[in-house]
Amino acid sequence: EEELQVIQPDKSISVAAGESATLHCTVTSLIPVGPIQWFRGAGPGRELIYNQKEGHFPRVTTVSDLTKRNNMDFSIRISNITPADAGTYYCVKFRKGSPDHVEFKSGAGTELSVRAKPSAPVVSGPAARATPQHTVSFTCESHGFSPRDITLKWFKNGNELSDFQTNVDPAGDSVSYSIHSTAKVVLTREDVHSQVICEVAHVTLQGDPLRGTANLSETIRVPPTLEVTQQPVRAENQVNVTCQVRKFYPQRLQLTWLENGNVSRTETASTLTENKDGTYNWMSWLLVNVSAHRDDVKLTCQVEHDGQPAVSKSHDLKVSAHPKEQGSNTAPGPALASAAPL
């Protein structure tokens, strides 16, 4: 007569996280009397998953009714599988005996692998803004996936990037894995509306990759160009001087007018014009009362953009071109007036 055999027909099974795993086990005989127990792992450190004789195992249900006479099916179903449940499960027949059960026979084991979806990729850029022509690094991270095989791609505005390095951790076996990738991106002046995309493809995603994005508007700083011009005379003894601040990003900008090196007025950019590429323009102007000046005036438009060192542009205003008339400016008040058009 053949003695009892423990049959685990599945060498391995793969289950998606959150689902239930069914581990099959049948025995070929009702003898010897004694319980079936399920373990994860082998050896002295093995973890008890289910004991037919006693104990409370809230996540485990038996596939068959073990109270049914002649039952030889000891398959179990484990609910709400997580990556931590991965491992090799053994169905073990014990022989009833005092003082402790004697292990009688073990099945060959069933390896449970857990398919866990990667978390949504998180893309982060540099801490400080950078200007066009500079190379900046973006990182992409995704966690908690299994199995280890995963594909990560970088795109800028739909164009695939090639300058990146990717690591999947840990290197050895684990219940779940993480991916970390760093891509290098060269900024251009047109990148305010650009996006950097990290795309992760994994077997659990059924061909629908996950994407994480970063807007380059959070990273780029486009410094302004300045142009100071003198407008035609508005009225006798008055000259209109404008400072055109063009193609800057982000909006944060402070402008100071200096008259012969002395601060005349400071204003913060408010009503801006947006360009198609996402940059901004702004214009500030001054009405200069030339009759208040005996000598030529050096007007300087000084701009501090996004906390960076100030840039400036100057304009020499020739007073001699406008002969001074005594008493023409008897009204009290400043020699310079300014306004910024709405």
Epitope: E1, E2, E3, L4, T28, S29, L30, I31, P32, V33, G34, P35, Q52, K53, E54, L66, T67, R69, N71, M72, R95, K96, G97, S98, P99
Partner: antibody, heavy 115, light 111 residues
Framework: RQLVESGGGLVQPGGSLRLSCAAS????????ISWVRQAPGKGLEYIGT?????ITYYASWAKGRFTGSKTSSTAYLQMTSLRAEDTAVYYC????????????WGQGTLVTVSS | DIVMTQSPSSLSASVGDRVTITCQAS????????LAWYQQKPGQAPKLLIY???TLATGVPSRFSGSGSGTDFTLTISSLQPEDFATYYC???????????FGQGTKVEIK
């Protein structure tokens, strides 16, 4: 499905007897066969269970004098050094207790130990 | 060895009565549920009624029920029928595979 015992009868004290238990309608290969006896006018008494190979065990009082064996169709109980107090109806039953209870029983065979 | 004590040893009851028989083990039975109940009529082999303390055997009428765990067990016949007059035995199993002991029996007689 049934079990049919045979081999009972009159035996002298100190003598031996071999009881048979034939199964029909099912195979004994995946089941234990247990032996239970009942002295006249008394209650039931468990003797032992015959499984496969080394899986054979007996109540403490029966060790040494009672040995069992089985094939896929028949189980046997060998009894030696019989005494008057062994006089009883001997039953075979399919099962080995706990989750494998004694569900099919033979009709019993009477063993009388007397000089 | 485990010792099983049944009570009462006999009882008289009428058809339709609710009958309760108890069985006490000298130690916890194996798995707290290694307890079966058998019915035996004169000149017949025993018949399995209940196993694993409360599982009804195939073909047994639902008026029979078993309960209990550890050391104390009960067989209940909810409404005694004429064919239920017989002797009832509990069989308890200890931790050792050979440690199986019957109670002394409870004879249910017609009042």
């Amino acid at each position: 499905r049934q079990l049919v015992e045979s081999g009972g009868g009159l035996v002298q004290p100190g003598g031996s007897l071999r009881l048979s238990c034939a199964a029909s309608g099912f195979s004994l290969s995946s089941h234990g066969i247990s032996w239970v006896r009942q002295a006249p006018g008394k209650g039931l008494e468990y003797i032992g269970t015959i499984g496969t190979g080394v899986i054979t065990y007996y109540a403490s009082w029966a060790k040494g004098r009672f040995t069992g064996s089985k094939t896929s169709s028949t189980a046997y109980l060998q009894m030696t050094s019989l005494r008057a107090e062994d006089t009883a109806v001997y039953y075979c039953a399919r099962g080995s207790a706990w989750n494998d209870p004694f569900d099919y029983w033979g009709q019993g065979t009477l063993v009388t130990v007397s000089s | 060895d485990i010792v099983m004590t049944q009570s009462p040893s006999s009882l008289s009851a009428s058809v339709g009565d609710r009958v309760t028989i108890t069985c006490q083990a000298s130690q916890s039975v194996y798995g707290n549920n290694d307890l079966a109940w058998y019915q035996q009529k004169p000149g017949q082999a025993p018949k399995l009624l209940i196993y694993l303390a409360s599982t009804l055997a195939t073909g047994v009428p639902s008026r029979f029920s078993g309960s209990g765990s550890g050391t104390d067990f009960t067989l209940t016949i909810s409404s005694l029928q004429p064919e239920d007059f017989a002797t009832y035995y509990c069989l308890g199993g200890g931790d050792d595979e050979a440690d199986n002991t019957f109670g002394q029996g409870t004879k249910v007689e017609i009042k």
